[in-house]
Amino acid sequence: PEPPTACREKQYLINSQCCSLCQPGQKLVSDCTEFTETECLPCGESEFLDTWNRETHCHQHKYCDPNLGLRVQQKGTSETDTICTCEEGWHCTSEACESCVLHRSCSPGFGVKQIATGVSDTICEPCPVGFFSNVSSAFEKCHPWTSCETKDLVVQQAGTNKTDVVCGPQDRLRA
């Protein structure tokens, strides 16, 4: 619009002046005046500000507490927060990843559909007909039943979702 109907995008209004905001990584020391420019200072070590701002204090970087199973995935800068993730075998309990829990295992009769990551839990699925899982595991998928025919054997015991079929020799008495 002409003329402007507000301060420009990276400005804020204070005492009738449109002052520049501080850029990411810097905090506000003093507002601009008729005589002076906005004064900004870089955030200190272990601090950040990720937007154009008029904050007088920088935010502290997130602490990845190893007691909660956390570790640093990406170190923070003056413009970005630290990103935490979980130790191997654990995953975040929330999007903010403030704590971790052990990956769940899939019980017998269930297989792993999707292996867990640092941010998502194991996804299990029931073993369909023709497949089984006889272990509790966070990695094992459902295995297909053994094909007795390909081994020139016959099914002696039918398989379930938890057990494989049992193959045996063909009955030689049958013509």
């Epitope: 002409e2 402007p4 002046q17 449109c18 520049s20 906005t38």
Partner: antibody, heavy 125, light 107 residues
């Protein structure tokens, strides 16, 4: 203190292009719009347009549309104005100027509070 | 485009004189007007914005008034350093045009 320092004088032939730079210091470059104004020898001031240094989006005066390109490099706090297909009547001093906005009586009033020292562009065959 | 007409174009005055420069707009521009001073070989310098607000660092002998289509710049007591060319500028409608200038010379 705020300073706008422009590139040196240029002599160009008709049909050529010229690119003038304007290096800003003493303030947050991306926080203020930058304007370009020219002044032919012994003449008045002529507004050419502006650039938003944050987004890089320019707005040009109709008269210069298609011939002028305004750009910026935020990493070095510098604005540029390039004028192509130069003619002899483009001979002028080219200025960059920073916009200031004052709020009063419910309105936002712009003006140009800091100017570069000017760059003389001479177009001659 | 909005036309700005300054009068007079030339003005001869002595140190200590009260000087008034007029700027007329071809259509109403509310208070979206600025005044600049320019000395030979130098960039313009902002004196007044929003028609009547004095820019910081500018001596109080300079004042601006007016609204709509008629504006004035007044120098209450002309000083030797005030001999220069003065421009008005409208900032309400693109292109933000300038007046043709008023040259203040020593009598």
């Amino acid at each position: 203190q705020v300073q706008l320092v422009q590139s040196g004088a240029e002599v160009k032939k008709p049909g050529a292009s010229v690119k003038v730079s304007c290096k800003a210091s003493g303030y947050t470059f991306a926080g203020y719009y930058m304007y370009w104004v020219r002044q032919a020898p012994g003449q008045g001031l002529e507004w050419m347009g502006w650039i938003n240094p944050d987004s890089g989006a320019p707005t040009y005066a109709q008269k210069f549309q298609g011939r002028v390109t305004m750009t910026r490099d935020t990493s070095i706090s510098t604005a540029y104005m390039e004028l192509s297909r130069l003619r002899s009547d483009d001979t002028a001093v080219y200025y960059c100027a920073r916009e200031k906005i004052y709020y009063g009586s419910g309105n936002y009033y712009p003006s140009f509070d800091y100017w570069g020292q000017g760059t003389l562009v001479t177009v001659s065959s | 485009d909005i036309q700005l007409t300054q009068s007079p174009s030339f003005l001869s005055a002595s140190v200590g004189d009260r000087v008034t420069i007029t700027c007329r707009a071809s259509q109403g521009i509310s208070s979206y007007l600025a005044w600049y001073q320019q000395k030979p070989g130098k960039a313009p310098k902002l004196l007044i914005y929003a028609a009547s607000t004095l820019q910081s660092g500018v001596p109080s002998r300079f004042s601006g008034s007016g609204s709509g289509t008629e504006f004035t710049l007044t120098i209450s007591s002309l000083q030797p350093e005030d001999f220069a060319t003065y421009y008005c500028q409208q900032l309400i409608s693109y292109p933000w045009t300038f007046g043709q200038g008023t040259k203040v010379e020593i009598k």
